[in-house]
């Protein structure tokens, strides 16, 4: 699996997205997990309805959400009030039985909102190059992850370079 | 930017314990694993454990688990790891790190080190 | 435990020549997730060790392009093309995929 980036801003909503085949897994639950590092384990966070049918219906845990389009494929996740914390390695599951299937593998990564101006810790501002178009976009920016690449870290403490 | 902080030497007893600490800083302390190891002059470095600050999640080298302990306090953002019952061939220089990214767990972040010493 | 032999144990070289680094695992080192965790780190004297190439063979950041790292299964590599002052110190490879992960015993690269 790549892994693909999802960027949101601090304080707002970012929603990711996971496609998959509806047929080959059609009836089993989905779940939202957060990996501990990129060889730690997964853990969850939420998952879809017990009701396989139901999967349409939003499910909460704090803040983050979870919803599944069964029919079309794609499985849905809200951060909301995204904050640093909420940083790292997730992956979205396909569960049957005990097993999980990896559906994707996502990088969310925060950035400082532009119109803060209070301390943003270890926020990235995003350069010219990778500004936003709208200072108010909720939904992420996503890209692929090549294997050995590292994105640049989403720090304004950047320079770290040895 | 990224700093670890480790005091510079701990001067100590055989049979007694030490609880090292490491300040993190710069960062957001509960996203990444914090790792020790233990460097012995002429004898390399060694990996004793690592822990992941949001969880407590901890991995150790079967060679140290039943004498050292690996804890952190999230709220000053302070790892430690407790070493008990030391003698001689403790006396090294300890070292916590921090993995570069979430999708580089190479070690790219070093405190400078704990001298221990254990001498009666 | 995996075992990382790392040879030569000292290297004498010239500045300017190439320099070549092994190191042998005692078993295959891919983790379960299919990434191979061997990097490489460079202890200058009385300085803190510093991370030069991670998962075989990417370069960390702000790390010269002279360093490269190689191989795959048992067997890896470390090579700098052209040596500079600033690359003497003590090489240590490192596996990162089961624990309890373990450093190489060091290869400590010198003048000629």
């Known amino acids: 699996h790549n892994t693909t980036v999802f960027q949101g801003v601090a304080g707002q909503s970012l929603q990711v997205s996971c496609p998959y085949d509806s047929m080959k897994h059609w009836g089993r639950r989905k779940a939202w997990c957060r990996q501990l590092g990129e060889k730690g384990p997964c853990q969850r966070v939420v998952s879809t309805h017990n009701l396989w049918l139901l999967s349409f219906l939003r499910r909460w845990n704090g803040s983050t959400a979870i919803t599944d389009d069964t029919l079309g494929g794609t499985l849905t996740i809200t951060l909301r009030n995204l904050q640093p914390h909420d940083a790292g390695l997730y992956q979205c599951q396909s569960l049957h039985g005990s097993e999980a299937d990896t559906l994707r593998k996502v990088l969310v990564e925060v950035l400082a909102d532009p119109l803060d101006h209070r301390d943003a810790g270890d926020l990235w501002f995003p350069g010219e190059s990778e500004s936003f178009e709208d200072a108010h976009v909720e939904h992420s920016i996503s890209r692929s992850l090549l294997e050995g690449e590292i994105p640049f870290p989403p720090t304004s403490h950047h320079h770290h370079h040895h | 930017q990224v700093q670890l902080q480790q005091p510079g030497a701990e001067p100590l007893k055989p049979g007694a314990s030490v609880k090292m600490s490491c300040e993190a800083s710069?960062?957001?302390?509960?996203n990444f694993w914090i790792t020790w190891m233990k460097l012995r002059p002429g004898q390399g470095l060694e990996w004793?454990?690592?822990?992941?600050?949001?969880?407590?999640?901890?991995n150790y080298n079967e060679k140290f688990k039943s004498r050292a302990t690996l804890t952190v306090d999230t709220s000053s953002t302070t790892a430690y790891m407790q070493l008990s019952s030391l003698t001689s061939e403790d006396s090294a220089v300890y070292y916590c790190?921090?993995?570069?990214?979430?999708?580089?767990?190479?070690?790219?972040?070093w405190g400078h080190g704990t001298l221990v010493t254990v001498s009666a | 435990d995996v075992l990382m032999t790392q040879s030569p144990l000292s290297l004498p070289v010239n500045l300017g020549d190439q320099a070549s680094i092994s190191c042998k695992s005692s078993q295959n080192i891919v983790h379960s997730n299919g990434n191979t965790y061997l990097e490489w780190y460079l202890q200058r004297p009385g300085q803190s060790p510093k991370l030069l190439i991670y998962?075989?063979?990417n370069r960390f950041s702000g790390v010269p392009d002279r360093f490269s790292g190689s191989g795959s299964g048992t067997d890896f590599t470390l090579k700098i093309s052209r040596v500079e002052a600033e690359d003497l110190g003590v090489y240590y490879c490192f596996q990162g995929s089961h624990v309890p992960y373990t450093f190489g015993g060091g290869t400590k690269l010198e003048i000629k």
């Open positions: 004793i454990g690592d822990i992941y600050p949001g969880t407590g999640n901890t």
């Open positions: 790190a921090r993995e570069a990214y979430y999708t580089n767990p190479g070690f790219a972040y």
């Open positions: 998962k075989v063979s």
């Open positions: 710069g960062y957001t302390f509960t």
